[in-house]
Amino acid sequence: RDKVMSEFNNNFRQQMENYPKNNHTASILDRMQADFKCCGAANYTDWEKIPSMSKNRVPDSCCINVTVGCGINFNEKAIHKEGCVEKIGGWLRKNVLEQKLISEEDLGGEQKLISEEDLHHHHHH
């Protein structure tokens, strides 16, 4: 399980690097951040380290009330402060890993962080 979490952490951070460059990656991360009410890998300050992201900006999907541009020049009180790796990892442990042995393909690869099916399952429960 620690290996799975470590993989997921590395993959999430890697996809954060791709966020400004890849629309598909961006939409997956946006959906995860919005659905799990989280921001960044460990926390929102991870977005400051992405070279092509302005330091006063997080994706709009980090906002508590998501509106276009809400992540620009954000106030800490207006965004989710919890990191996604802990939050999604905890949910994975509880809801997915205990139900099925998750393969590394399910967790990452180049495009998929969590299978669409799993995300859909979280969204409706």
Epitope: T45, E48, S54, K55, N56, R57, G69, C70, I72, N73, F74, N75, E76, K77, A78
Partner: antibody
Framework: QVQLVESGGGLVKPRGSLRLSCAAS????????MNWIRQAPGKGLEWVSY????????YYADSVKGRFTISRDNAYNSLYLQMNSLRAEDTAVYYC????????????WGQGTTVTVSS | DIQMTQSPSSLSASVGDRVTITCRAS??????LNWYQQKPGKAPKLLIY???SLQSGVPSRFSGSGSGTDFTLTISSLQPEDFATYYC??????????FGQGTRLEIK
């Protein structure tokens, strides 16, 4: 009413140190980012530093980086600017400024405190 | 860093005149543009935020417009208390927070 009051300015020799304070009242202090902005005599406004609500994020203008340190104490509704290795070009009125962020603009300014660096 | 350029740097006008000050950003800043007024010996005061929204308590003769890189501050009918220095400032991409160099509005 909403108020920011700076203190701690004065005359200091080059390479000296000074600590500015800003006391906030009339609003929930940790709802806001806070800035220090300065204005040299007869010159325009220059941003010096800002700090996030929690104090986790701090940024500085290149001109003061490594010499100035911004901090805040939310329990005491206070903002600080520790200024070390002061130079003549740091001579200015220093303003403590409230920043709601997003597109709202810096909506509350203190009266300013004067820092003069001279031998 | 985003540079802000104001024009003119100084301006002479009479009470009752319509006055326009412009501010240009070195790259697009959407509508993240604010205008401040400063009188001698006083702290700046926020007039307009988000390019065109009037700050509470500011007289309606002040208005702002623009988006992207070009912005204007207009005073529809100058009053004696409006003679001051005006600054634009961007908050789209920070740090640093950047200001224009200021426009000094003087009595003709």
């Amino acid at each position: 009413q909403v108020q920011l009051v700076e203190s701690g300015g004065g005359l200091v020799k080059p390479r000296g140190s000074l600590r500015l304070s800003c006391a906030a009242s009339g609003f929930i202090f940790d709802d806001y980012f806070m800035n220090w902005i300065r204005q040299a005599p007869g010159k325009g406004l220059e941003w010096v530093s800002y700090i996030s609500n929690s104090g986790n994020t701090k940024y500085y203008a290149d001109s003061v980086k490594g010499r100035f340190t911004i901090s805040r104490d939310n329990a005491y509704n206070s903002l600080y600017l520790q200024m070390n290795s002061l130079r003549a070009e740091d001579t200015a009125v220093y303003y403590c400024v409230r920043d709601p962020r997003s597109y709202y603009g810096m909506d509350v300014w203190g009266q300013g405190t004067t820092v003069t660096v001279s031998s | 860093d985003i540079q802000m350029t104001q024009s003119p740097s100084s301006l002479s006008a009479s009470v009752g005149d319509r006055v326009t000050i412009t501010c240009r950003a070195s790259q697009s800043i959407s509508s993240y543009l604010n205008w401040y007024q400063q009188k001698p010996g006083k702290a700046p005061k926020l007039l307009i935020y988000a390019a065109s929204s009037l700050q509470s308590g500011v007289p309606s003769r002040f208005s702002g417009s623009g988006s992207g890189t070009d912005f204007t501050l207009t005073i529809s009918s100058l009053q004696p208390e409006d003679f001051a220095t005006y600054y634009c400032q961007q908050s789209y991409s920070t740090p640093p927070i950047t200001f224009g160099q200021g426009t000094r509005l003087e009595i003709k």
